[in-house]
């Protein structure tokens, strides 16, 4: 079977500052030099793109300047960080990996990471 398997954690809790990090690991059936990693958010049956980055194997992962994602890559493992999350962003985040070049193309879709985001309680007014 020449399918590409993608593994990611089932659950991640975002920090109080709205930052969530998780690892997306893929078992590559081919010798790709160019890889695209996309984070998708699934809500009900709607799937929307959160961020995407293309990288050359051995080089760093670069997201667009205005992206809410950052990441680093090491071999077939990508460390993803999503910032600026709020409670309403709680949901299933899917890691999609595509081997772009050279052909053949391969698609790998993870089962998703449920990210829980809890908005911090506002600080009570201090009399001091």
């Amino acid at each position: 079977c020449k399918a590409m398997h993608v593994a990611q954690p089932a659950v991640v809790l975002a920090s109080s500052r709205g930052i969530a990090s998780f690892v997306c690991e893929y078992a590559s059936p081919g010798k790709a030099t160019e890889v695209r990693v996309t984070v998708l958010r699934q809500a009900d049956s709607q799937v929307t793109e959160v961020c995407a980055a293309t990288y050359m194997m051995g080089n760093e992962l670069t997201f667009l300047d205005d992206s809410i994602c950052t990441g680093t890559s090491s071999g077939n493992q990508v460390n993803l960080t999503i910032q600026g999350l709020r409670a309403m962003d709680t949901g299933l985040y899917i890691c999609k990996v595509e081997l772009m070049y050279p052909p053949p193309y391969y698609l790998g879709i993870g089962n998703g990471t449920q990210i829980y985001v809890i908005d911090p309680e506002p600080c009570p007014d201090s009399d001091f």
Partner: antibody, heavy 118, light 108 residues
Framework: QVQLVESGRGIVQPGRSLRLSCAAS????????MHWVRQSPGKGLDWVAF????????YYADSVKGRFTISRDNSKNTLYLQMNSLRAEDTAVYYC???????????WGQGTLVTVSS | EIVLTQSPGTLSLSPGERATLSCRAS???????LAWYQQKPGQAPRLLIY???SRATGIPDRFSGSGSGTDFTLTISRLEPADFAVYHC?????????FGQGTKVEIK
């Protein structure tokens, strides 16, 4: 709503060329990979070519490699298929299709008929 | 190249009956990358099922997909007049993207 409209249909002689276009609307064209798929009369579907959202990487079916070229103009929201050295077996309805976020072809054009005959 | 073989070629049934369509792959396909399309005469294909069992937007729940490995099934629980069409399976996990030859569901 997502709309894909192909144009360029025609009857051409073997060995000649033809260019198909696919005008996209209702979505951010530059964010999606696009495919060409064809269907010979009374037959099944055959994938022809794929181009990434940025137009940089392209893939072709063996049957058209070296003869067909897929391209796109994101400023015009248009996908193209340049078909050279046409053969009788290239006679088919040609569809453009969008690659959905999870991989399947989630939107299709209405198709355009190409007939290669002397 | 992954070859997909659909059976039967034609299925003759009456409205209200259950339709079971088969798609067999020449090598194992992850269920995440298997789709079904419906095509009516003179029309473009329409995505029905992706990921082997997830219904596309707007697809009624009488359509369901199942299977894994090399054997996949599309089931239409109770055929309605609008369901008589050709159904194609497809794998989209690797290039070349491939389709089955189609199963025609016709009125008996």
């Amino acid at each position: 709503q997502v709309q894909l409209v192909e144009s360029g249909r025609g009857i051409v002689q073997p060995g000649r060329s033809l260019r198909l276009s696919c005008a996209a609307s209702g979505f951010t064209f530059s964010s999606y990979g696009m495919h060409w798929v064809r269907q010979s009369p009374g037959k099944g579907l055959d994938w022809v070519a794929f181009i990434w959202d940025d137009g940089k990487n392209k893939y072709y079916a063996d049957s058209v490699k070296g003869r067909f070229t897929i391209s796109r103009d994101n400023s015009k929201n248009t996908l193209y298929l340049q078909m050279n050295s046409l053969r009788a077996e290239d006679t088919a309805v040609y569809y453009c299709a969008r690659k959905g976020q999870l991989g399947p072809f989630d939107s299709w054009g209405q198709g355009t008929l190409v007939t290669v005959s002397s | 190249e992954i070859v997909l073989t659909q059976s039967p070629g034609t299925l003759s049934l009456s409205p209200g009956e259950r339709a079971t369509l088969s798609c067999r792959a020449s090598q194992s396909v992850s269920s995440s990358y298997l789709a079904w399309y419906q095509q009516k005469p003179g029309q473009a294909p329409r995505l029905l099922i992706y990921g082997a069992s997830s219904r596309a937007t707007g697809i009624p729940d009488r359509f369901s997909g199942s299977g894994s490995g090399t054997d996949f099934t599309l089931t239409i629980s109770r055929l309605e007049p609008a369901d008589f069409a050709v159904y194609h399976c497809q794998q989209f996990g690797s290039s070349p993207w491939t389709f089955g030859q189609g199963t025609k569901v016709e009125i008996k």
